[in-house]
Interface confidence: low
């Protein structure tokens, strides 16, 4: 039949080529003369000319070696033909199949492999995986079947086998307990790929694992006892750096570390922060210590770190003994604000109050006062009691001064300590009201017409309080009543000024006397501008020029 | 193969700003903590910032302390440096390298130009 | 701030020849110094970390050793791609420091 079965050649043969592989025949050569020829890639395709048949025989022949990792199958078609051309045949075809030869090592896909594994792991943990490639069948064949193995490993502490490699996967786990990064940070294992399952050609590369740190040591202080002094009042002080030492890998959370005091501040008085960078504590003052009423604290202090321990480690704990050193302490003005009522225009040499401070030393320090800010002068103080006294009159309508009724003074405490040392204190004196302003008119000049002539109203003021103001009381004097008539409203706030009788064009004095709900009168002279006019008048028409 | 390469340096101003970025690949960035290290003209190497392999904790010499910032982004295998407050002796060629505890600066990158002037 | 005094600032040596390079720490850094080699380039590659350690795919002329605060680094027989900048970094103290480098010359 014009049948062929699939050819198979193994590859880089020896030859002698040509070589014969295989017959192509037509029984139709019974008949006639046959011609024989291939067709395909390999033959007349590239890569040409890798077969070729003998056209008169029919033998197909291999010209040259053939490699099963370049093509692995060539898929040619046979033709019969008589002597005339004619095609006696189908096209026939023709499968040669290139059967392997282990003609290639393993590859490692990296020279070198990095992975990475905490410290302290459980036998059994997956570290990392190498993987290595070999161009050879690997499913017909073992040729490129590779198997993993390590041929060494560096350091061999504590010992040389802490590591294992799947044979077929290339997973390289770890096979022993003891990695301690801080004896062994990394190890560098020769790592072996042979074809043949494991009984051929063999390659090598580097597993480089590194050991990752876990929190396995805790920190120490070095040393445990400290000694400080502190001046006491001082805030934010910095009273010690605490030291530690930390096995694991410096500036890791498990190396970073935490301070916490145990005991001995029972009134929260101090505060303990890492250094960023030394991993120092430092132990500084939240709020001022006082002498007076504790000398010495013991503090206890205890270091873990940022990281949890990944097994029960013992606390190291360090003991600061904190002196507080004794500071001259400023006087204290008790109270600090002073809030005293006094009558406005209290004779000079009238005593205000006493106002004195207190030391917080336990020395019987002397004190001695003087007024630090008076500025309207009216005060004085004496140096020895802190008694105040008025040397000026006290004017609660002084607006330059007195504010809402107060008139504020700062004073000032001095001890004799060395250096002294000043408090202040401030003293607040509430102005009592009395009756010393009369009522004023606003405005005092008022232009009016002489025929219909329009009431002027006129504001009063007073600048003293209820009750020594309103209602108020208006009087005409020096014969001012003749020509106009002064009425106060019933508010009793504003008074009105009439014209009663015609007057001729001219500037008037009206006498207005206005008296307060206290009786304190004052006398008002009020500029009364009289135009030739009717009704509503704001300045008298021309050509007068005003008197 | 480990690779980082630096970009974004630049000319600029005394005063202003410049953000740096350095790209990783071939190891596995997340877990190794990362510097910025510079090279000045006259040649002197200067370390300028550290960050953790998280990104939690980050490090630096007085002489960029509040101006120099270093980040990462782990997602995105990139390491970054914002520098403010730029002077003339902050020019110099900035490069990335990994910084493994007890092992660092094992990959460098190639450098990128940060020059500082009016 | 910890000092790294290195030395000699430059070098001029012959292919073949054996040369070392020194840092001297100011403080106690333990092991904690890496040998970087700089290429006229710009590009950076580490040789050594924690003094002795020698990185994945450097070549075994290069060694690092310790004497007290002394720290050096030794090329064993020079080769024509071993020329460049040489410098220390100690990561034992904070601030990391470098030292000032070594140019190493073809004579």
């Known amino acids: 039949d014009w049948v062929v079965a699939p050819i198979s050649v193994p590859e880089n043969g020896k030859g002698p080529f040509p070589q014969r592989l295989n017959q192509l025949k037509s029984n139709k050569d019974r008949d006639t003369k046959i011609f024989y020829s291939i067709t395909g890639p390999g033959a007349d395709s590239p890569p040409e000319g890798v077969f070729a048949v003998e056209k008169e025989t029919g033998w197909l022949l291999l010209n040259k070696p053939l490699d099963r990792e370049e093509i692995a199958k060539y898929e040619l078609f046979g033709h019969a033909v008589s002597e005339n051309g004619a095609s006696v045949e189908d096209p026939m075809n023709i499968s040669i199949i290139v059967t392997d030869q282990n003609d290639h090592k393993p590859k490692f896909t990296q020279d070198t492999f990095r992975g990475s594994v905490l410290e302290g792991v459980m036998p059994g943990t997956s570290v990392m995986q190498v993987t290595a490639t070999d161009e050879d069948d690997a499913v017909n064949t073992y040729n490129g079947v590779v198997a993993y193995s390590i041929h060494s490993q560096e350091p061999k502490e504590p010992h040389d086998l802490m590591f294992t490699i799947h044979k077929s996967t290339g997973t390289i786990s770890v096979i022993s307990s003891g990695l301690d990064r801080e004896k062994v940070p990394e190890y560098r294992l020769t790592v072996q790929a042979t074809d043949m399952d494991g009984e051929g050609s063999t390659t090598t590369a580097e597993a480089v694992v590194q050991i990752l740190d876990a929190n396995d040591n805790a920190p120490e202080f070095d040393p445990q006892k400290y000694e400080a002094h502190v001046p006491e009042n001082a805030v934010g002080h910095e009273v010690q750096r605490l030291t530690v030492t930390d096995l694991d890998a410096p500036n890791s959370p498990a190396w970073r570390a935490t301070y916490l005091i145990m005991g001995g501040d029972d009134g929260d008085h101090f505060t303990i922060t890492t250094h960023p960078e030394s991993n120092q504590g430092i132990l500084t003052t939240r709020k001022g210590l006082d002498f007076e009423a504790k000398n010495q604290h013991t503090l206890y202090v205890e270091v873990t770190n940022e990281a949890p321990f990944v097994l029960k480690l013992p606390t190291s704990t360090a003991t600061i003994v904190v002196h507080v050193e004794d500071v001259n302490e400023a006087p204290v003005f008790v109270p600090p604000s002073k809030v005293v009522e006094v009558q406005e225009g209290i004779p000079t040499g009238e005593p205000v109050c006493v106002y004195t401070a207190e030391d917080p030393d336990k020395e019987n320090q002397k004190i001695s006062y003087r007024i630090l800010r008076d500025p309207a002068g009216w005060l004085a103080m004496d140096p020895d009691s802190g008694q105040v006294t008025a040397v000026g009159t006290l004017d609660r309508e002084d607006e330059q001064f007195v504010r809402n009724n107060i008139y504020e003074v700062m004073v000032l405490a001095m001890d004799n300590g060395s250096p002294p040392t000043t408090g202040t204190g401030t003293l607040l004196l509430t102005l009592i009201d009395v009756n010393d302003h009369g009522p004023v008119p606003e405005p005092r000049q008022i232009t009016i017409c002489n025929q219909s002539p329009v009431r002027q109203v006129l504001n009063i003021t007073d600048k003293d309080l209820s009750p020594h103001t309103s209602p108020f009381q208006a009087q005409l004097t020096d014969d001012s009543d003749i020509y106009w008539t002064a009425e106060v409203n019933e508010e009793g706030d504003t008074v009105v000024l009439s014209l009663k009788k015609f007057l001729k064009q001219d500037t008037y004095d009206v006498h207005l006397s206005l008296s307060d709900h206290g009786n304190k009168e004052q006398l008002t002279v009020i500029r009364a501008t009289v135009c030739d006019c009717h009704g509503h008048v704001e300045t008298c028409p021309g050509p007068w020029k005003g008197g | 193969v480990q690779l980082v390469e630096e970009s974004g340096g630049d000319l600029v101003k005394p005063g202003g700003s410049l953000k740096l970025s350095c790209a990783a690949s071939?190891?596995?960035?997340?877990?190794?903590?990362m510097s910025w290290v510079r090279q000045t003209p006259d040649k002197r190497l200067e370390w300028v910032a550290t960050?953790?392999?998280?990104?939690?904790?980050?490090y630096y010499p007085d002489s960029v302390k509040g101006r120099f910032t270093i980040s990462r982004d782990n997602a995105k295998n990139t390491l970054y440096l914002q520098m403010s407050s730029l002077k003339s002796e902050d020019t110099a060629m900035y490069y990335c390298?990994?910084?493994?505890?007890?092992?660092?600066?094992?990959?460098w990158g190639q450098g990128t130009t940060v020059t500082v002037s009016s | 701030e910890l000092q790294m005094t290195q030395s000699p600032s430059s070098l001029s040596a012959s292919l073949g020849e054996r040369v070392s390079l020194t840092c001297r720490a100011s403080?106690?850094?333990?092991?904690?110094l890496n040998w970087l080699q700089q290429k006229p380039d710009g590009t950076i590659k580490r040789l050594i970390y924690?003094?002795?350690s020698l990185d994945s795919g450097v070549p075994k002329r290069f060694s690092g050793s310790r004497s007290g605060s002394d720290y050096s680094l030794t090329i064993s027989s020079l080769e024509s791609e071993d020329f460049g900048d040489y410098y220390c970094?100690?990561?034992?103290?904070?601030?990391?420091?470098f030292g000032a480098g070594t140019k190493l010359e073809i004579k």
């Open positions: 390298a990994s910084y493994y505890y007890g092992s660092p600066f094992a990959y």
């Open positions: 924690d003094t002795s």
């Open positions: 071939g190891f596995t960035f997340s877990t190794y903590g």
């Open positions: 960050i953790s392999s998280g990104g939690h904790y980050s």
């Open positions: 403080q106690d850094i333990g092991s904690s």
């Open positions: 970094v100690q990561y034992g103290s904070s601030p990391l420091t």
